[in-house]
Interface confidence: low
């Protein structure tokens, strides 16, 4: 790889490797390996074994580290208002008398007038304002499927508020549903968490705009405090470049590995603790893929001559638009590793080890 | 500012500013700025404003920008699992003929032997191995309180499987306000999700230890595989140096701004529109605090002669262990923005725009 | 307390020139729009023209449009009204008035007004 | 003509409750611009009452309440007194207009 100068990847991998040593001692706070003379003889007990593998074992429901934000999300979103139906439709009668829940109705042509086709979506949110109130409450929100069933989108623990709130709830994938289902009225539910063995199931929430007998719920205040769906999409005009050649990659381990990319990139650096670092401390892993950042990204001066053409790199040379930007990670992950202290085995997990993807910065 | 070649601010703000101008055209996917020539006089639309302000405000329920790592998390956690109580325990007995959960009970007095005080805790997962099943179903779970009521914690939306699988629920704040009520038993409960107006109240998950008439739930295999909480801590001895002089500080405004920090850190920098771009097309806001980072972020020889205080530093310069570690943005916000487009006014909202904290990476 | 205080109107021929003064006090001056109105004798009231906070940008009514010029200045706090080649149909009590929020079109405070009569 | 329409004149005895309406169109009140109430008593300069349509400016008593719904704002005074006698004003930006703002004709409040 060359930026201005020729980059002598041997030393980079060396420093590199010297870090990871540094590293790993600063984050188990030690001045120095530790002494391997009271170490059982044979393997590992099946107890530690089976609390690294937990450790390292990605489960369902554990986040995983947030991936790389997609082209699409560098660029502009346009942002558009949904009020949800006028309370006084018809549709809204069934739902009069129920009392663990409000129903809010939107139109689908309304939100398609907003984001003519499903994949331009980048954000929707249903927000609604909660009157002020002395009760706590868990609530649920519900989306319509076919016929009378609800699909639970998610919930919330409302505590007393002296001033009404906005809360807010993300309904991207419901509304990108609803955009692919044609025209028509799609439904919400706003209901009460009801226990299996509580009797209470009444909403105590008000929200402004649809709860009744609220004064001053007229007008424009009414109108602007009504439930609604705030939009984010890439307008279609813009949407079309999205598609073209010059789009911006993922720079991680399946890009990054198998290209020539000279500008920033993740490169690959397997770490043996015996052979690299000289230690036998670490009982396990034997090693880890640490792999590092590598690449010139170029500064545009925005002053170019082609600048149509300068812009386009934005996105991939410069996102945030540092004055000196750098190549550093993006996504990264932790290790577990097994070690003993005296003749105890011990079980750590070390934070933000491996790299992963790299960004320009 | 100084490093090895004194920094000219005034041109690295030049240069920030001249980046900002072409990244904004960019998000916009603008090659120029657009003309303002049909932009009508007078004041934005009530509804532009509207929009323009939701955008602008945090609401309950969103999610902000994920905080920097405390200085704790950079240290290495030691891991450690304690088993649920044993199911032949008397206090199992009053919860075997309820259908809609299942209970699982945690002796305190274990969970602090692996954490003796609450701070330390870093995360504590509960987790537990669903048996192969051919239903869907929503279950939550739920943290005994007081007397016989019980505080929701999660919920999961479980598909069908073909072979066990482990679930993980995040209960890291139940497990520290376990820690801080003294010793004793402390309970969990995982039931069906009960809407208001279903019938059908029963849990048909099944979970390994639990769940009862499975063969093969005897001896290790069952003691392995019953539900247990992973516990992530911060080991005593180690916890001390976190209050020692030589802590890790969050390089972001509250700091950088009010200090004289030569070292990596968030600078002031905020962007009048008209002033520095030139700009009239942006219609709200007039400017915004861009910000940008600034410093050296020295690379530390791990073979350092002063190797104990050379570790020290790790933790601040370099972190991620790089081999040219190099000071970038860590949390940034978008900005929204009002212009026009002929006639038509547009709120959009442009990504990590505002640069509020910074890390050597 | 947010004082605005007009001067410079008067009696002028038909085709003369008059400059109105505005002299603002108790409010920060360059953060603020403002606009003339006037009120003709019995009549209602009409927005002649409005300056942007930092004197960028001017909007006039199509009846005063081309003979009318309004500026500002903002070390001064002051606000002028230049009005060329008048006719007998701008005789009227004008008043400034400040906007309620930055370029709002609401005007939350006014001045007392000066009369301009123009006749031969 | 006035593009905000009012009626010239309106009447009412202390104690009562009137309703002053402006109608526009949706390039100003229908097109969610801010739309304001001014009140001008006999010989002094006009102040605001109401502001964006609902809200009330500060020292204007609550007996004055401001809405709008479409292209009809309505300006409604509930307890009138003897001292509400005035000209009444509404105003909006218009964006159909190369004038930029304008005001209605005027409603002229007489107490019994």
């Known amino acids: 790889l060359s930026t201005c100068k020729t980059i002598d990847m041997e030393l980079v991998k060396r420093k590199r490797i010297e870090a990871i040593r540094g590293q790993i001692l600063s984050k188990l706070r030690l001045a120095s390996p530790p002494s391997q003379g009271e170490v059982p003889p044979g393997p590992l007990p099946e107890a530690v074994l089976a609390l690294y593998n937990s450790t390292r074992d990605r489960v369902a429901g554990e986040s995983a580290d947030p991936e790389p934000e997609p082209e699409a999300d560098y660029y502009a979103k346009e942002v558009t208002r949904v009020l949800m139906v006028d309370r006084n439709n018809a549709i809204y009668e069934k739902t009069k008398d129920i009392s663990h829940s409000i129903y809010m109705f939107f139109n689908t042509s309304d939100i398609r007038e907003a984001v003519p086709e499903p994949p331009l979506l980048s954000r929707a949110e249903l927000r609604l304002q909660r009157l002020k109130s002395s009760v706590e409450q868990h609530v649920e929100l519900y989306q319509k499927y076919s016929n009378n069933s609800w699909r639970y989108l998610g919930n919330r623990l409302l505590t007393p508020t002296d001033t009404p709130e906005w809360l807010s709830f993300d309904v991207t994938g419901v509304v990108r549903q609803w955009l692919n289902q044609g025209d028509g009225i799609q439904g919400a539910r706003f209901s009460a968490h009801c226990s299996c063995d509580s009797k209470d199931n009444k909403l105590h929430v008000e929200i402004n705009g649809i709860s009744p007998k609220r004064r001053g719920d007229l007008g424009t205040i009414h109108d602007m405090n009504r439930p609604f769906l705030l939009l984010m999409a890439t307008p279609l005009e813009r949407a079309q470049h999205l598609h073209s050649s010059r789009h911006r990659r993922a720079l991680d381990t399946n890009y990054c590995f198998s290209s020539t990319e000279k500008n920033c990139c993740v490169r690959q650096l397997y770490i043996d603790f015996r052979k690299d670092l000289g230690w036998k401390w670490i009982h396990e892993p034997k090693g880890y893929h640490a792999n590092f950042c590598l690449g010139p990204c170029p500064y545009i001066w925005s002053l170019d001559t082609q600048y149509s053409k300068v812009l386009a790199l934005y996105n991939q040379h410069n996102p945030g638009a540092s004055a000196s930007p750098c190549c550093v990670p993006q996504a990264l992950e932790p290790l577990p590793i097994v070690y003993y202290v005296g003749r105890k085995p011990k079980v750590e997990q070390l934070s933000n080890m491996i790299v992963r993807s790299c960004k320009c910065s | 500012l100084s490093t090895c070649k004194t920094i000219d601010m005034e041109l690295v703000k030049r240069k920030r500013i001249e980046a900002i101008r072409g990244q904004i055209l960019s998000k916009l996917r603008l090659a120029s700025p657009p003309s303002q020539g049909e932009v009508p006089p007078g004041p934005l639309p009530e509804a532009v404003l509207a929009l323009y302000n939701s955008t602008r405000d945090r609401v309950a329920g969103e999610s902000a920008d994920p905080e920097p790592e405390p200085e704790a998390d950079y240290y290495a956690k030691e891991v450690t699992r304690v088993l649920m109580v044993d199911r032949n325990n008397a206090i199992y007995e009053k919860t075997k003929d309820i259908s809609h959960s299942i209970y699982m009970f945690f002796n305190t007095s274990d969970i602090r032997e692996a954490v003796p005080e609450p701070p330390l805790l870093s995360r504590a997962e509960l987790r537990l191995q669903r048996l192969k099943s051919s239903v869907e179903q929503h279950v939550e779970l739920y943290q005994k309180y007081s007397n016989n009521s019980w505080r929701y914690l999660g919920n999961r939306l479980l598909t069908p499987t073909d072979t066990p699988e482990w679930l993980s629920f995040d209960v890291t704040g139940v497990v520290r306000q376990w820690l801080n009520q003294g010793d004793g038993i402390q309970g969990a409960r995982f039931s069906a999700h009960c809407s208001c107006d279903s019938k059908d109240n029963k849990l048909h998950v099944e979970i390994n230890g639990i769940s009862p008439k499975r063969r093969g739930d005897l001896g290790t295999i069952h003691d392995m595989n019953r539900p247990f909480l992973l516990l992530m801590a911060t080991p005593l001895e180690r916890a001390q140096h976190l209050h020692s002089s030589r802590h890790r500080r969050a390089l972001d405004t509250n700091y950088c701004f009010s200090s004289t920090e030569k070292n990596c850190c968030v600078r002031q920098l905020y962007i009048d529109f008209r002033k520095d771009l030139g700009w009239k097309w942006i219609h709200e806001p007039k400017g915004y605090h861009a910000n940008f980072c600034l410093g050296p972020c020295p690379y530390i020889w791990s073979l350092d002669t002063q190797y104990s205080k050379v570790l020290a530093l790790y933790n601040q310069h370099n972190p991620g262990a790089s081999a040219s570690p190099c000071c970038v943005p860590q949390a940034l916000e978008p900005l929204p923005i009002v212009y026009y487009v002929g006639r038509k006014p547009k709120v959009e909202q442009l990504s990590n725009m505002i640069v509020r904290s910074c890390k050597c990476s | 307390e947010v004082q605005l205080v007009e001067s410079g109107g008067g009696l002028v021929q038909p085709g003369g020139s008059l400059r109105l003064s505005c002299a603002a006090s108790?409010?920060?001056?360059?953060?603020?729009?403002v606009h003339w109105v006037r009120q003709a004798p019995g009549k209602g009231l009409e927005w002649v023209s409005h300056?942007?906070?930092?004197?960028?940008?001017?909007y006039y009514a199509d009846a005063v449009k081309g003979r009318f010029t309004m500026s500002r200045d903002n070390g001064k706090n002051t606000l002028y009204l230049q009005m060329n080649g008048l006719k007998s149909e701008d005789t009227a009590v004008y008043y400034c008035?400040?906007?309620?929020?930055?370029?709002?079109?609401?005007?939350?405070?006014w001045g007392q007004g000066t009369q301009v009569t123009v006749s031969s | 003509l006035p593009v905000l329409t009012q009626l010239s004149s309106m009447s009412g005895s202390p104690g009562q409750t009137v309703t002053i309406t402006c109608t526009g169109s949706?390039?100003?009140?229908?097109?969610?611009?801010?739309l304001s109430w001014y009140q001008q008593l006999p010989g002094t300069a006009p102040k605001l009452l109401i502001y964006?349509?609902?809200n009330r400016a500060s020292g204007v008593p609550n007996r004055f309440s401001g809405s709008k719904s479409g292209n009809l704002a309505s300006l409604t005074i509930t307890g009138l007194q003897a001292e509400d006698e005035a000209d009444y004003y509404c105003g909006c930006y218009d964006s159909s207009l190369s004038t930029g703002y304008v005001f209605g004709g005027g409603t002229k409040l007489t107490v019994l």
């Open positions: 108790g409010f920060t001056f360059s953060n603020y729009g």
């Open positions: 300056i942007s906070a930092a004197g960028i940008s001017r």
């Open positions: 949706s390039s100003n009140i229908g097109g969610g611009y801010y």
């Open positions: 008035a400040k906007d309620r929020i930055r370029s709002s079109y609401e005007y939350d405070s």
């Open positions: 964006n349509a609902n």
